[in-house]
């Protein structure tokens, strides 16, 4: 639900199209002041399901650079560094919002787009044992 | 970098403010047609670093609902179901873009905002600090 009664102090919009097209201020406000995102930056190497990060760049998208995780192994890594065939490394995926230039190459007109990105990997048991 | 030369067919903008405020079409285009995000929905339970999903709701934000992962254990789960405290369950975090109503309660005016969300958990070897 994105429809909320308008304040008298809100910028005007043509109700005919509302709320299909909105004004967005691109001066990003970063609410992550209390959390240091670098803290998790080495997890990709220390995980039992380690991953590599691949740069996905698209100048028609905002943000133009997205980092995509690819699990290094199909199995998980044991304490001795060898593969555990009984467990699987799998990507954790999340749907995120991005802005897609529409029409293409236009600097000030965008469409909201949902894309699925792999954020990292986790180690799972392949079989779910169903108890009678 | 969000500045790209404008096509003649682009909606007009006041270059004085450009590209601070842009037009965004909220009819979301979903590019995830080939991938079913539900496929990974049981990983949270089957992972060696399982997590719970908590609903974070904010009507002043778009999307208004975001699911936040919280690791169930400090350690990781072994094959026998017991927790291994020599390993750590840690959240995998990602910075995502959301739209924040600005001014508040306005239906058609937003500011881009970055927030840090926990998407899931992974099992990592703890960092051992060697004392000289």
């Amino acid at each position: 639900g994105i429809a909320i009664p308008r304040n008298s102090g809100c910028p005007n919009s043509e109700d005919k199209n509302f709320p299909r097209t909105v004004m967005v201020n691109l001066n990003i406000h970063n609410r992550n002041t209390s959390t240091n995102p670098k803290r998790s930056s080495d997890y990709y190497n220390r995980s039992t399901s380690p991953w590599n990060l691949h740069r996905n760049e698209d100048p028609e998208r905002y943000p133009s650079v997205i980092w995509e995780a690819k699990c290094r192994h199909l199995g998980c890594v044991k304490a001795d560094g060898n593969v555990d065939y009984h467990m699987n490394s799998v990507p954790i995926q999340q749907e995120i919002l991005v802005l897609r230039r529409e029409p293409r190459h236009c600097p000030n007109s965008f469409r909201l787009e949902k894309i699925l990105v792999s954020v990292g990997c986790t180690c799972v048991t392949p079989i779910v044992h169903h108890v009678a | 970098g969000i500045a790209i030369p404008r096509n003649s067919g682009c909606p007009n903008s006041e270059d004085k403010n450009f590209p601070r405020t842009v037009m965004v079409n909220l009819n979301i285009h979903n590019r995830n047609t080939s991938t079913n995000p539900k496929r990974s929905s049981d990983y949270y339970n089957r992972s060696t670093s399982p997590w719970n999903l908590h609903r974070n709701e904010d009507p002043e934000r778009y999307p208004s609902v975001i699911w936040e992962a919280k690791c169930r254990h400090l350690g990781c789960v072994k094959a026998d179901g017991n927790v291994d405290y020599h390993m750590n369950s840690v959240p995998i975090q990602q910075e995502i873009l959301v739209l924040r109503r600005e001014p508040r309660h306005c239906p058609n005016s937003f500011r881009l905002e970055k927030i840090l969300v926990s998407v899931g958990c992974t099992c990592v070897t703890p960092i051992v600090h060697h004392v000289a």
Epitope: L74, G75, G81, N82, V83, D84, Y85, H86, N88 | R39
Partner: antibody, heavy 120, light 107 residues
Framework: EVQLVESGGGVVQPGRSLRLSCAAS????????MSWVRQAPGKGLELVAI????????FYPDSVKGRFTISRDNSKNTLYLQMNSLRAEDTAVYYC?????????????WGQGTLVTVSS | DIQMTQSPSSLSASVGDRVTITCQAS??????LAWYQQKPGKAPKLLIS???SLETGVPSRFSGSGSGKDYTFTISSLQPEDIATYYC?????????FGGGTKVEIK
């Protein structure tokens, strides 16, 4: 050119042992997972054993567990399968196969196979 | 163990025909599926991994699709050199298991 050449097959009596070898060439053997896969006459394919790139991890299905042992000598570029307590149902063509990755999940190169016949 | 049910067990088609083989796993294998071609007296050859990824050098008439438990292998236009037995293999849960095979013949 990647080449895998199996040897050591033959006719053996039930309960006896046999050791198969697979000589690898044309690639850096020590960085690839390897497996043995068998095919009984006129039948389908069955996994026999898996070994990762450095020999630190192995896996055997129940049908051969405790009887067969997979090993590798990376200095000799050779994969082995030690088969003990052989049974008639072990009769098959035995292929050694390479995984395109470190570990041994699926197989991009196969040898020509060596026939093992268990018969009294 | 995960059972892989492949069908049909054999088929006969004309050159140029579209050929479809299905493989059903007894549970979700999360796209960890390979397809192989085996010609008489020869070793198997890997065609597809990850359910859809064509191996280098494999003709584009071969393709794979599917997800969850159900997967399909397609030859878009059957050629005489495609006469072989085709196998699927899951590598989601050990032991890796193969389908029973599909023997493809020319009419």
């Amino acid at each position: 050119e990647v080449q895998l050449v199996e040897s050591g097959g033959g006719v053996v009596q039930p309960g006896r042992s046999l050791r198969l070898s697979c000589a690898a060439s044309g690639f850096t053997f020590s960085t690839y997972g390897m497996s043995w896969v068998r095919q009984a006459p006129g039948k389908g394919l069955e996994l026999v054993a898996i070994i990762n790139h450095n020999g630190g991890s192995t896996f055997y299905p129940d049908s051969v567990k405790g009887r067969f042992t997979i090993s590798r000598d990376n200095s000799k570029n050779t994969l082995y399968l030690q088969m003990n307590s052989l049974r008639a149902e072990d009769t098959a063509v035995y292929y050694c196969a390479r995984d395109p990755r470190h570990d041994g999940y699926f197989f991009d190169y196969w040898g020509q196979g060596t026939l093992v016949t268990v018969s009294s | 163990d995960i059972q892989m049910t492949q069908s049909p067990s054999s088929l006969s088609a004309s050159v140029g025909d579209r050929v479809t083989i299905t493989c059903q796993a007894s549970e979700d294998i999360y796209d960890r599926l390979a397809w192989y071609q085996q010609k008489p007296g020869k070793a198997p050859k890997l065609l597809i991994s990850g359910a859809t990824s064509l191996e280098t050098g494999v003709p584009s008439r071969f393709s794979g699709s599917g997800s969850g438990k159900d997967y399909t292998f397609t030859i878009s236009s059957l050629q005489p050199e495609d006469i072989a037995t085709y196998y699927c293999q899951q590598y989601w849960s050990v032991p890796w298991t193969f389908g029973g095979g599909t023997k493809v013949e020319i009419k």
